[in-house]
């Protein structure tokens, strides 16, 4: 067999809200996949494991099951939605998304993936972590990489 | 306005347990957290743990988990820190703070001091 | 854990100076650092946290900067009331420790 390539994109768009009784913020991010099958039959994709980590801190879960068959030598963009929650030891952030005297209240995200492929009863699993940039203070819908987080000592507020 | 009031100084045997209270007044207790900070004989801070009314979460610096217990009174808005199996080390003013999160405490208690003495 | 390292350990100046007083982290904590003022005696006060946001109440002549490992708490124009001990504090992860402190006197 053939590679199984996955190549996480970036984040697609986050939509955010907040519960000003909780000092609470929930942030909807869609992220974006290219998983290429590199061989010359089908391959499944069973499903995608989904994690997001702000200040080493698990915020957010998503699983997709049953999600799309790639054909031979094909490639298939796929989107997943994690829903998380910054919250309570995180909520220092509170202050920092609302404010509104800054535009950009960009947070640096850990974004970790893990795909499940099958073909012929064979399982495969590859993982992928990234860090990126996300506006915790508006609804923002990103060009493809533009989210990518580069500097590691210098972040953007 | 905002305002933390602690319980008085404790004078304590070793070996013994005390349990400092601190009543929150002036915004919805349940809305921020309350964190606790020790500081002995004038000298550096240290974050104990800090607990969240709503839910009842708590989260401990590691080296205070056997040593302290975080809870929180909802009907009365008091917060509580009890000191367990106490020794000459546990003598300090204990501090507790209305909680931005993750410890940042932006109103302050007056402080208790405990004094553990044979 | 994560540590904090400050400097100076003690500082004299006169008012109207202007002083900055430092704190490291052990590894990149990104922005999330406080900055609190303790009078001897008193209770600690918020003054800055998020690295450069200014706590209610705070005087504009104190400021925060910095990112990653490395931050500043500048005074300008020292006033009377501002003598005392400093401390810096990350709020990135557990458990969220303070810098040894800095002991700001009058010259």
């Known amino acids: 067999p053939r590679s199984i390539d996955v190549k996480y994109i970036g984040v697609k768009s986050a939509y955010v809200s907040y519960d000003v009784q909780k000092r609470t913020i929930y942030l909807n991010i869609t992220n974006t996949l290219n998983i290429t099958n590199n061989n010359y039959y089908s391959v499944e994709v069973e499903n995608i494991t989904a994690q997001v980590q702000f200040s080493k801190t698990v915020i957010g879960k998503a699983r997709l099951n049953n999600i799309t068959i790639i054909g031979p030598l094909d490639m298939k963009q796929i989107d997943y939605t994690v829903p998380t929650v910054i919250a309570e030891e995180m909520s220092y952030m509170y202050d920092f998304c609302t404010l509104i005297s800054i535009k950009v209240h960009n947070i640096v995200l850990m974004m970790q993936v893990t795909v499940t492929t099958t073909y012929f009863g064979h399982s495969e699993q590859i993982s992928q972590e990234r860090y990126q940039y996300v506006d915790c203070g508006r609804n923002t819908t990103y060009q493809l990489g533009q989210s990518e987080y580069l500097n590691v000592l210098q972040p953007q507020q | 306005q905002v305002q933390l009031q602690q319980s008085g100084t404790e004078l304590a045997r070793p070996g013994a347990s005390v349990k400092v209270s601190c009543k929150a007044s002036?915004?919805?207790?349940?809305?921020?957290?309350i964190t606790w900070v020790k500081q002995r004989g004038g000298q550096g801070l240290e974050w104990i743990g800090e607990?969240?009314?709503?839910?009842?979460?708590?989260y401990y610096n590691e080296k205070f988990k056997d040593k302290a217990t975080l809870t929180a009174d909802k009907s009365s808005s008091t917060a509580y820190m009890e000191l367990r199996s106490l020794t000459s080390e546990d003598s300090a003013v204990y501090f507790c703070?209305?909680?931005?999160?993750?410890?940042?405490?932006?109103?302050w208690g007056q402080g208790t001091t405990v004094t553990v003495s044979s | 854990d994560i540590q904090m390292t400050q400097s100076p350990a003690s500082l004299s100046a006169s008012v109207g100076e202007t002083v900055t007083i430092t704190c490291r982290a052990s590894?990149?904590?990104?922005?999330?650092l406080a900055w609190y003022q303790q009078k001897q005696g008193k209770t600690p006060q918020l003054l800055v946290y998020?690295?450069?946001m200014l706590a209610e109440n705070v005087p504009s002549r104190f400021s925060g900067s910095g990112s990653g490992t490395q931050f500043s708490l500048k005074i300008n124009s020292l006033q009377p009331e501002d003598f005392g001990s400093y401390y810096c504090q990350h709020h990135y992860g557990s458990p969220p420790a303070f810098g040894a402190g800095t002991k700001l006197e009058l010259k």
């Open positions: 998020n690295g450069k």
């Open positions: 607990i969240y009314p709503r839910s009842d979460n708590t």
């Open positions: 002036g915004y919805i207790f349940t809305t921020y957290g």
């Open positions: 703070a209305r909680s931005k999160g993750s410890g940042t405490g932006d109103y």
């Open positions: 590894e990149n904590i990104y922005i999330y």
